[in-house]
Interface confidence: low
């Protein structure tokens, strides 16, 4: 790498007399005037705004006590204005200034782009006392420079409360490019158009940006960074990167994937979590999303039936969670179940059929025909039904429930009897005289209970009085 | 289910251009792409192009170019090839076969074939 | 474009026997891309294994494939007379899409 100085401003030694060491001296003014030479007046007019006082970056002292002669003006030399170099090289560069020597506690500071720099700097100040006056060289040396050393270098000097600032030293550090902006990987619709950013920055400028497809160069001629690169459309998955030059050399970007958007493999893995009468739960393991976030799934459902009409039911839910309750299914069915889902491409295809039960439900229909008879000189009632027309989904008949309310002045009592599948009259004891017994029946099966059948009443006197009430639900067809 | 029905069989003569037809059914269409595959009498498979039903967008084998002209027609879910300046070496079976494209192509599902007999 | 060698171009086989079929890439493929169909005689060519490995719908388990690279094989574990068919591998991996040349299966 080459290390350059370019002199930005003209050196203007300020002060007379040889200062130590190797820096330049000059007699010249600072305002380059031939025909001055020695101290310089206190009063000094801008070269720009002729006719206005110039102080800037200048402190003018005041009278001495003999107040027979002024003091000069104190300004830091100028120095070498623009230091270009490149990353993990040294560099070192100084600021001086002459000082009265009545001039005590003379601090010099350096200030980078606005701001002090404090701390763990490389900075060293020498004094260099004389008769009259103090040279002071202020060094700043950076080891290994950076892009961030990169910037604008003062140095900063209090007097009787003024402030004496120096020219700035420019510091340029030069490497390869440097990304600011990479591409990024996308996912895109076949055949639509898309962009891609790059973005590298020096020094040196400029950068100049190529664009890479799938390790072939995509423009000829290379663009001014920031570039974005329109690409019309892809109809297969492709890898862009750029590459970026500058007079150091080249650096190249990320690859990134650009993944054509696709529909989405079928999901995969449909398990039975539980099932009921009515219900089945369900899982899923989602398929490759084909490069397009899921939108929603659909459930299918046909019951494995030789007699059923082989219609599909669609339950459609949200992609997330990978979980649905299919409810509305018969009790005691098989069924058949694929999983499907969608992205903004279009439907997966369905997922592999499982196979699924419902387990027994609740007969549907209550016992037919019940009649209640009072039997007096047992002292009981003698209750019969008829077996209800239950659906085979209904399942096994395991019994029927009875419930028996009695009812007289003042009381109300309900009592439930359970008898077995093959009853088709049960007789209970009379609980309650004077009184009217309330008689309901429904059909159990291992899925539940059925509906009861409508109420059949009968009055139950007091002892000597007879009386039967027969009827409520009369067989199909009796009526 | 998934199904391509293709044309019936074609007798032409050289010179002349035909035009076979497939007609996709149990998908959504315009969703996947239509491909074409050639295969003369006792040989291999080999791949003519394919276009994309959404826009139709086309890609052809070189060899193919000029030759072979694919279209759709979405309304009725229908692809078409049409095969310009016919010689004997155009004598085959045509399939039509959609493509799960999803940057691990494949053919999934396939046409019946037309066989195309080029003769004077 | 990407040539698929297979071999053996034909092969007589019994019933019972373990049939292995290999598919040489000219080029690298990733095994995302590489496919098998069979055609039975006087019909289409059908799905068999795509993505190297994963049997399609349908397609008994005595079928497997594997590979990668350039190298890629199928197998059927036990040959069965219906297997009697064309053989055809395919990559899906770059334009021109391409298939190898075949494998008959006969039966001795």
């Known amino acids: 790498a080459i290390t350059e100085a370019r002199e930005e401003a003209k050196p203007y030694p300020l002060f007379p007399g040889p200062l130590p060491g190797s820096l330049q001296t000059d007699h010249t003014s600072l305002l380059s005037l031939p025909h001055t030479s020695g101290y310089q007046p206190a009063l000094m007019f801008s070269p720009t705004q002729p006719g206005r006082p110039y102080t800037g970056n200048v402190a003018i002292p005041r009278v001495t006590s003999a107040g027979s002669k002024l003091l000069p003006p104190l300004a830091f030399k100028h120095t070498v204005g623009h230091i270009i170099l490149s990353e993990h090289k040294d560099v070192k560069f100084n600021c001086s200034i002459s000082v009265p020597n009545i001039y005590q506690d003379t601090t010099i500071s350096w200030w980078k782009d606005g701001k002090e720099l404090l701390g763990a700097h490389h900075a060293i100040t020498q004094f260099y006392p004389d008769d009259e006056v103090t040279a002071i060289i202020a060094s700043f040396s950076i080891t290994s420079v950076q892009r961030s050393d990169n910037g604008s270098y003062i140095c900063k000097m209090k007097i009787n409360n003024e402030e004496i600032v120096s020219d700035p030293i420019y510091i340029e550090v030069q490497g390869l490019p440097h990304f600011t902006k990479q591409p990024e990987s996308m996912n895109v619709t076949r055949n639509t158009a898309f962009n891609l950013t790059c973005q590298a920055v020096g020094p040196p400028e400029p950068v100049n940006i190529f664009w890479v497809q799938n390790s072939s160069r995509v423009n000829e001629q290379p663009e001014k960074s920031p570039s974005v690169l329109t690409v019309p459309g892809l109809t297969e998955m492709a890898v862009f990167s750029c590459e970026a030059h500058n007079d150091k050399g080249l650096t190249v970007s990320k690859g990134v994937q650009i993944n054509i958007k696709a529909i989405p493999s079928p999901p995969t893995e449909v398990s039975i979590h539980n099932s009921t009468a009515h219900s089945i739960l369900i899982s899923w393991v989602p398929g490759f999303d084909g490069y397009s976030p899921f939108r929603n799934c659909s459930v299918q459902v046909k019951e494995v039936d030789p007699l059923s009409n082989g219609s599909v039911m669609i339950f459609n839910t949200s992609a997330s969670p990978h979980m649905y309750q299919i409810k509305q299914l018969q009790a005691l069915a098989n069924y058949s179940i694929g999983v499907s889902c969608m992205n903004e491409i279009g439907w997966s295809a369905v997922s592999p059929w499982i196979l699924a039960s419902t387990t027994e439900g609740a007969p549907s229909v209550a016992p037919l025909n019940v009649t209640v008879f009072l039997n007096e000189s047992r002292d009981n009632v003698d209750i019969r039904w008829m077996k209800p027309l239950t659906k085979r989904q209904a399942g096994e008949l395991v019994g029927y429930r009875i419930s028996h309310v009695w009812q007289s002045a003042g009381i109300s009592k309900e009592l439930l009897e359970e008898v077995g599948q093959n009853n088709s009259r049960a007789q209970i004891s009379v609980q309650v005289h004077n009184a009217t017994c309330t008689v309901r029946i429904a059909a159990v099966t291992k899925g539940g209970v059925g509906p009861f059948s409508d109420p059949v009443k009968i009055f139950i006197p007091a002892h000597g009085w007879v009386d039967h009430a027969p009827s409520s639900t009369p067989a199909p067809g009796n009526a | 289910q998934v199904q391509l029905q293709q044309s019936g069989p074609e007798l032409v003569k050289p010179g002349a251009s035909v035009k076979l037809s497939c007609k996709a059914s149990?998908?959504?269409?315009?969703?996947?792409?239509i491909n074409w595959v050639k295969q003369r009498p006792g040989q291999g498979l080999e791949w003519i192009g394919w276009?994309?039903?959404?826009?139709?967008?086309?890609k052809y084998k070189e060899k193919f170019k000029g030759k072979a002209t694919l279209t759709v027609d979405t309304s009725s879910s229908t692809a078409y090839m049409e095969l310009h300046s016919l010689t004997s070496e155009d004598s085959a079976v045509y399939f039509c076969?959609?493509?799960?494209?999803?940057?691990?192509?494949?053919?999934?599902?396939w046409g019946q074939g037309t066989t195309l007999t080029v003769s004077s | 474009e990407i040539v698929l060698t297979q071999s053996p171009t034909t092969m007589a086989t019994s019933p019972g026997e373990k049939i292995t079929i290999t598919c040489s890439a000219s080029?690298?493929?990733?095994?995302?891309?590489l496919h098998w169909y069979q055609q039975k005689p006087g019909f289409s060519p059908k799905l068999l294994i795509y993505r190297t490995s994963n049997l399609a719908s349908g397609v008994p388990d005595r079928f497997s494939g594997s590979g990668s690279g350039t190298s890629y094989s199928l197998t059927i574990g036990t040959m069965e007379a219906e297997d009697v068919a064309t053989y055809y591998c395919q990559q899906g991996r770059s334009i021109p899409l391409t298939f190898g040349a075949g494998t008959k299966l006969e039966l001795k």
């Open positions: 149990g998908y959504t269409f315009t969703s996947y792409d």
């Open positions: 080029s690298s493929i990733s095994s995302n891309y």
């Open positions: 276009i994309y039903p959404r826009d139709g967008y086309t």
């Open positions: 076969a959609r493509g799960f494209y999803s940057n691990l192509y494949y053919f999934d599902y």
